[in-house]
Amino acid sequence: APVRSLHCTLRDAQLKSLVMSGPYELKALHLQGQDLEQQVVFSMSFVQGEESNDKIPVALGLKAKNLYLSCVLKDDKPTLQLESVDPKNYPKKKMEKRFVFNKIEINNKLEFESAQFPNWYISTSQAESMPVFLGGTRGGQDITDFTMQFVS
């Protein structure tokens, strides 16, 4: 069967929403009211990978765009990027590992760990309007916890 994809939005633990910042970058900032319409809607695909009750492998595409979050090495450092793909071939059940995140939910905390780079997580800064990035620390200054709102 083809891969199942569901639409959702994300907010970090500080309640910052994610919006586009240029063509290939996301940033996190507080939005209210009408401005919430600016937030990115993800198409979250349930992909092949190691799975448990708390951990589900997913790919995070941008709704109605052929862009996916992916994790690559840049200057020897794991880096989060938005990567353009051929819409005829994506999403698919067997996504390349750079596109796969382990969606981990424990005790009201939702994290997205890179499958390509274990212990590296989708992260936001405490500061407003800073880029979403791949971070290698949890529980520090940077935010790795999110909530997810599914949408029609």
Epitope: R4, H7, E105, K109, F146, M148, V151, S152
Partner: antibody
């Protein structure tokens, strides 16, 4: 025995609030996504709220978004549905059900609690 | 949103009859389909998920089949306790929606 027991239903005036509870037993509550499904008198079924096993994921259809809030207390094996700004069209039997977004189907249901919104 | 249409909306059959209910989705739901039984005054009960997998404890006279947009629910030999309303539900894309139900009566 796996069981879900709802409470908190009743008759309420339009615009008022009501809080439903669902007590779970016989399974490890904190490992399961949970939902509320309602059934208007003589009508079919409508999925009205979802919460993931840890509470970090939620869903509401447009018909209740901004008025209903689902929450859970895993330490007390209890699911809640806070219903505000109630309307006549919210009149229904409300069922607590085990399951949600990922699994997609509802494999355990409570007996239901009736909510009537009327002036 | 994907709409689910069940047919017939009601039907009468005799004990021992083979009974078939159909459910049509407005789009391809790739077997992400469930069937529930609701007896009068009771909560729904899961019978079948993933279009054809029988839930635990469900008698083997119940079965499901289909693919794409068209799905079928069958009771191979109707029993008196099968008097109920049957609902299909898809879970391919949010919102997961239910069919309007098929009320089954015994003649």
């Amino acid at each position: 025995e796996v069981q879900l027991v709802e409470s908190g239903g009743g008759v309420v005036q339009p615009g008022r609030s009501l809080r439903l509870s669902c007590s779970a037993s016989g399974f490890i509550f904190s490992r399961y996504d949970m939902s509320w499904v309602r059934q208007a008198p003589g009508k079919g079924l409508e999925w009205v709220a979802y919460i993931s096993h840890g509470g970090a994921g939620t869903y509401y259809p447009d018909s209740v978004k901004g008025r209903f809030t689902i929450s859970r207390d895993n330490s007390k094996n209890t699911l809640f549905l806070q219903m505000d700004s109630l309307r006549a069209e919210d009149t229904a039997v409300y069922y607590c059900a085990r399951g949600g977004v990922y699994k997609g189907y509802f494999d355990v249901w409570g007996q239901g609690t009736p909510v009537t919104v009327s002036s | 949103d994907i709409q689910m249409t069940q047919s017939p909306s009601s039907l009468s059959a005799s004990v021992g009859d083979r009974v078939t209910i159909t459910c049509r989705a407005s789009g391809n739901i790739h077997n992400y389909l469930t069937w529930y039984q609701q007896t009068p005054g009771k909560a729904p009960k899961l019978l079948i998920y993933n279009a054809k997998t029988l839930a635990d404890g469900v008698p083997s006279r119940f079965s499901g089949s289909g693919s794409g947009t068209d799905y079928t629910f069958t009771i191979s030999s109707l029993q008196p306790e099968d008097i109920a309303t049957y609902y299909c539900q898809h879970f391919w894309s949010i919102p997961y929606t239910f069919g309007q139900g098929t009320k089954l009566q015994i003649t």
